[in-house]
Amino acid sequence: SERCDDWGLDTMRQIQVFEDEPARIKCPLFEHFLKFNYSTAHSAGLTLIWYWTRQDRDLEEPINFRLPENRISKEKDVLWFRPTLLNDTGNYTCMLRNTTYCSKVAFPLEVVQKDSCFNSPMKLPVHKLYIEYGIQRITCPNVDGYFPSSVKPTITWYMGCYKIQNFNNVIPEGMNLSFLIALISNNGNYTCVVTYPENGRTFHLTRTLTVKVVGSPKNAVPPVIHSPNDHVVYEKEPGEELLIPCTVYFSFLMDSRNEVWWTIDGKKPDDITIDVTINESISHSRTEDETRTQILSIKKVTSEDLKRSYVCHARSAKGEVAKAAKVKQKVPAPRYTVELACGFGAT
C-alpha cells in the first residue's frame, strides 16, 4: 500500500461511552489534524474509511456495517453505534484517501458499564457553581446531534442514585438543571438521562457530571498574607536554622493563577548565593479557597543573612501583596560570671 500520513493513536481523545447506549463519534482528522472539513474532502473525491483493532488484539479489521438493525453505521464523518456493546471497545481508525492522498488517525474507544446508581469508571467533567450566587444552571452535556429538533425527548435528572424531585433549591427544567442558591450540600454527581424514540426503538443517553460549589466572585478578595506579620519576630543566633513561613489565603477565582514567592534583598532565592530551600504546601477549603504556605529555610544562618530583607509576595487575579518578615540577630545574654562580678561592684 502507498504511503499514508499516519497521525498515530490520538490518546488525547480517550472516548468513553456507556454500554447499550447510542454513540456518535466524529473522525478526529477534521477536528484536529487537517485544515479542511469533511465536505471539502468529499467534494474533492476523497473517501473516508473506518476500521478498528479489538481490545487486546493487534489485527486491524474492517468495521462490520452489515449488522442487524444497522447497529454500526457511518454518516459523513461520524461513526454511529445504535447502541454500543461492551466488546466494541478498541482502537478505531479513520482514513481519508484517494489514489494520490492518504491521511489517517486512530483513537481509543472504551465502552463502559455503569451500576444502578450511574457509578462507572467514566471520567466525569466538573462543573463549578458559585456559592449563594443566585440562579445558576447546568446543561445535560454532549447530546447534540443524536436526534432531530422535531423529536421531543424526555429528560430525567438524578443526584447520585435519586431522581431529583422536591429538592428545595434544585429544579429540573428539561435539558437544564437549575440551582436557585447553590450550597455546599449541592456538591455531588448529577446524571441526566435523555430518552428518545428512533425508528420504532427507544434509546437512552446517560450523562454524569460532578458539581462542585466554589467561592463566589462577590466574596473574592486580594490575597491575604497571614504570615509573616508584625507580631512575630524571627530572632536567631548565627549557626541556627532560620525557618520563616509565608502563609497566604486566596479566595477562589475561576481560572486564576495563584502565586507565592519569596525575595531576599529584592532578588529571587535562585538568584542569590546563600543556601536557601523553599518548601510549599497547599490546602483547600470546601469552597476551593486556597491556602498556600511556603517555608523559607536557611540551615545555618550567618550574621550577614540576619541583616537581609526577607519579603513574601503573593499574586492572584484580584491583586498583588507583599509582607516583610521581621528578622534580627539575637543579642547574646551576658555570661553569668561577668554579670555577678558587676553586681558586686568588682573592677
Epitope: D20, P83, D115, S116, Q165, N166, T195, T202, H204
Partner: antibody, heavy 117, light 107 residues
Framework: QVQLVQSGAEVKKPGSSVKVSCKAS????????MNWVRQAPGKGLEWMGR????????HYAQKFQGRVTITADKSTSTAYMELSSLRSEDTAVYYC??????????WGQGTLVTVSS | DIQMTQSPSSLSASVGDRVTITCQAS??????LNWYQQKPGKAPKLLIH???GLHAGVPSRFSGSGSGTDFTLTISSLEPEDVATYYC?????????FGGGTKVEIK
C-alpha cells in the same frame, strides 16, 4: 428486538414456594432494571420488586418484603422471582418487565401461578 | 405508598370518538407517570412515559398530559384495536403503584 420469555404455568400448594424465570434477549441484560409485577384474576397490576442485574441491587415492595427474592444470572441473561409461603391469594399471573430507567418498556408474556390445596 | 386513582373504571365509546382517562395521585409525583395498555389475555404494553413521552412505535393518536397530581391519557380518535384496559403508574417514589385500570370498549 427485546424479548422476555417466561417459564410455564405452575400449580402450587399453600405454604410452598414458586420460582418463575424470565429469559431476556435483544438488549444488554446488565444495563436495565428487571421488574416483577403480578395480576390476580380480574384485578389490576401490582408491583412486587426489581433488580439491576449489573450490580445486583434490588428493591422490594413492603408488602412482599421477606417473602419475595429477585435474582439474576448474568451468564444466561435470566431473572428469577421466588415467592415463598404461598397462599391462595397469591394466585395470579406474574410478569417480568424490563426498563432502562423506571418505566417498564417491555414485558414478558406472563406466568400463571395457581395456589390450591 | 402513593395511591393512584383512575376514572372512569370503564367506558364505552364509538370508533372515531375522543376518549379521555384521568389518573389522580395521592401526592405530587413530578410528572413521573406512565400509561400502559393491556389487551385481554396479553401482557401490558408501555404507551407513554414521563407523563407525555410517546413510547417508540405507539400511534400518535395517544397522548398524555398533566402535572403534580392530576394526569390524563387521551385517545384522539378511537380505533377498534384500542379496546383494552389502560393503567397509569407512578414511578416517583418506590414502591411503584398502579391505578385500578380503565376498561375501554367500543359501543
Amino acid at each position: 428486538q427485546v424479548q422476555l420469555v417466561q417459564s410455564g404455568a405452575e400449580v402450587k400448594k399453600p405454604g410452598s414456594s414458586v420460582k418463575v424465570s424470565c429469559k431476556a434477549s435483544g438488549y444488554t441484560f446488565t444495563s436495565s432494571w428487571m421488574n416483577w409485577v403480578r395480576q390476580a384474576p380480574g384485578k389490576g397490576l401490582e408491583w412486587m420488586g426489581r433488580i439491576y442485574p449489573g450490580d445486583g441491587q434490588t428493591h422490594y415492595a413492603q408488602k412482599f418484603q421477606g417473602r419475595v427474592t429477585i435474582t439474576a444470572d448474568k451468564s444466561t441473561s435470566t431473572a428469577y422471582m421466588e415467592l415463598s409461603s404461598l397462599r391462595s391469594e397469591d394466585t395470579a399471573v406474574y410478569y417480568c418487565g424490563e426498563g432502562y430507567l423506571d418505566p417498564m418498556d417491555y414485558w414478558g408474556q406472563g406466568t400463571l401461578v395457581t395456589v390450591s390445596s | 405508598d402513593i395511591q393512584m386513582t383512575q376514572s372512569p373504571s370503564s367506558l364505552s365509546a364509538s370508533v372515531g370518538d375522543r376518549v379521555t382517562i384521568t389518573c389522580q395521585a395521592s401526592q405530587g409525583i413530578n410528572n413521573y407517570l406512565n400509561w400502559y395498555q393491556q389487551k385481554p389475555g396479553k401482557a401490558p404494553k408501555l404507551l407513554i412515559h414521563y407523563t407525555s413521552g410517546l413510547h417508540a412505535g405507539v400511534p400518535s393518536r395517544f397522548s398524555g398530559s398533566g402535572s403534580g397530581t392530576d394526569f390524563t391519557l387521551t385517545i384522539s380518535s378511537l380505533e377498534p384495536e384500542d379496546v383494552a384496559t389502560y393503567y397509569c403508574q407512578q414511578y416517583s417514589i418506590l414502591p411503584w403503584t398502579f391505578g385500578g385500570g380503565t376498561k375501554v370498549e367500543i359501543k
